[in-house]
């Protein structure tokens, strides 16, 4: 049942909850509403998921197909360097801050963007699929 860490690689499990999109071995939730970064993180955690942690350029390119010009929060923060919420460093793409308040990361169809964490944006959650959707 895709057990273990939220950040582990998922086995190929059957399905995703309603309103989640299955892509590869993961389920993705693209929000309709907007929240600040912390509230977005809480939303994902409350649903046994995490704010999107992108593992490589391939996953980033695939996800960007589903994005527009509007930025979405992802699980990326600048704490003495840009790191994903699983603790891994950002090493396959570039992001730069234009001011000291831009410590959270967002993505749109064109790439990554640093932003103040207070800005209300859409967000993307990522989780492992469930064998039984009733578990969600």
């Amino acid at each position: 049942l895709c057990q273990g860490s939220n950040y582990s690689t998922c086995a190929s499990c059957p399905s995703c909850p309603d309103r989640w999109m299955k892509y590869g071995n993961h389920c993705y939730y693209f929000s309709v509403e907007e929240k600040d970064w912390n509230s977005s993180l809480e939303f994902c955690l409350a649903r046994d998921s995490h704010l999107l942690v992108i593992t490589d350029n391939q996953e980033m390119s695939l996800l960007q197909v589903f994005l527009s010009e509007a930025f979405c929060w992802i699980g990326l923060r600048n704490n003495s360097g840009w790191r994903w919420e699983d603790g891994s460093p950002l090493n396959f793409s570039r992001i730069s801050s234009n001011s000291f308040v831009q410590t959270c990361g967002a993505i749109n169809k064109n790439g990554l963007q640093a932003s103040s964490c207070e800005v209300p944006l859409h967000w993307v959650c990522k989780k492992c699929p469930f064998a039984d959707q009733a578990l969600f």
Partner: antibody
Framework: EVQLVESGGGLVKPGGSLRLSCAAS????????MSWVRQAPGKGLEWVAT????????YYADSVKGRFTISRDNAKNTLYLQMSSLRAEDTAVYYC?????????????WGQGTLVTVSS | DIQMTQSPSSLSASVGDRVTITCRAS??????LAWYQQKPGKAPKFLIH???TLAEGVPSRFSGSGSGTDFTLTISSLQPEDFATYYC?????????FGQGTKLEIK
């Protein structure tokens, strides 16, 4: 169209207080950091204060720290600058300014300014 | 605090001239620099951010360059409406310091 309209300026005695307001329209006020920048007569621009989106974080120039308070009312789309213990050197045109978005803290939009004169 | 120093403080030029204004930071600010134009009795107008990115609606005759400590604003062919005072500004951190301004006058 982005519009920022300052008000509340005027003549005040040294040691006195004044509250400036900036009415914002044409954009979603609650998505942007806001700032005050001033310009003494015949002089250059000086950053005064900046406030975060929620109002939870405020930042001040050393020259006004402890005397000025920046605040905002997102429900009223209004930015404020409460000025106290005013000095002659605070005489200036005070501009309200909006950042570029996403916490890009350059001053992308400016109001027309309001003149504060501190004199006995 | 980071200090911003502009040169020259004033400059005379003619319509059609190419003009360059310099801004120097007291320490490395990478590309965290903005430029503004101000006409007498008016509010400043935002021209450039990140040292070289033109703000929306700014004519292409304006350009910015530089990184680190040395920056320039260039107007490739001066127009009558370009005569004004220009300011640079450090935009990454507190305090957001401005240069003292460069007054561009008609020769």
């Amino acid at each position: 169209e982005v519009q920022l309209v300052e008000s509340g300026g005027g003549l005040v005695k040294p040691g006195g207080s004044l509250r400036l307001s900036c009415a914002a329209s044409g954009f979603t006020f609650s998505r942007y950091y806001m700032s005050w920048v001033r310009q003494a007569p015949g002089k250059g621009l000086e950053w005064v204060a900046t406030i975060s989106i929620s109002g939870g974080q405020t930042y001040y120039a050393d020259s006004v720290k402890g005397r000025f308070t920046i605040s905002r009312d997102n429900a009223k789309n209004t930015l404020y600058l409460q000025m106290s213990s005013l000095r002659a050197e605070d005489t200036a045109v005070y501009y309200c300014a909006r950042e570029g978005g996403y916490g890009n803290l350059w001053f992308a939009y400016w109001g027309q300014g309001t003149l504060v004169t501190v004199s006995s | 605090d980071i200090q911003m120093t502009q040169s020259p403080s004033s400059l005379s030029a003619s319509v059609g001239d190419r003009v360059t204004i310099t801004c120097r930071a007291s320490e490395n600010i990478y590309s965290a620099l903005a430029w503004y134009q101000q006409k007498p009795g008016k509010a400043p107008k935002f021209l450039i951010h990140n040292a070289k990115t033109l703000a929306e609606g700014v004519p292409s005759r304006f350009s910015g360059s530089g990184s680190g400590t040395d920056f320039t604003l260039t107007i490739s062919s001066l127009q009558p409406e370009d005569f004004a005072t220009y300011y640079c500004q450090y935009h990454y951190g507190i305090p957001f310091t401005f240069g003292q301004g460069t007054k561009l006058e008609i020769k």
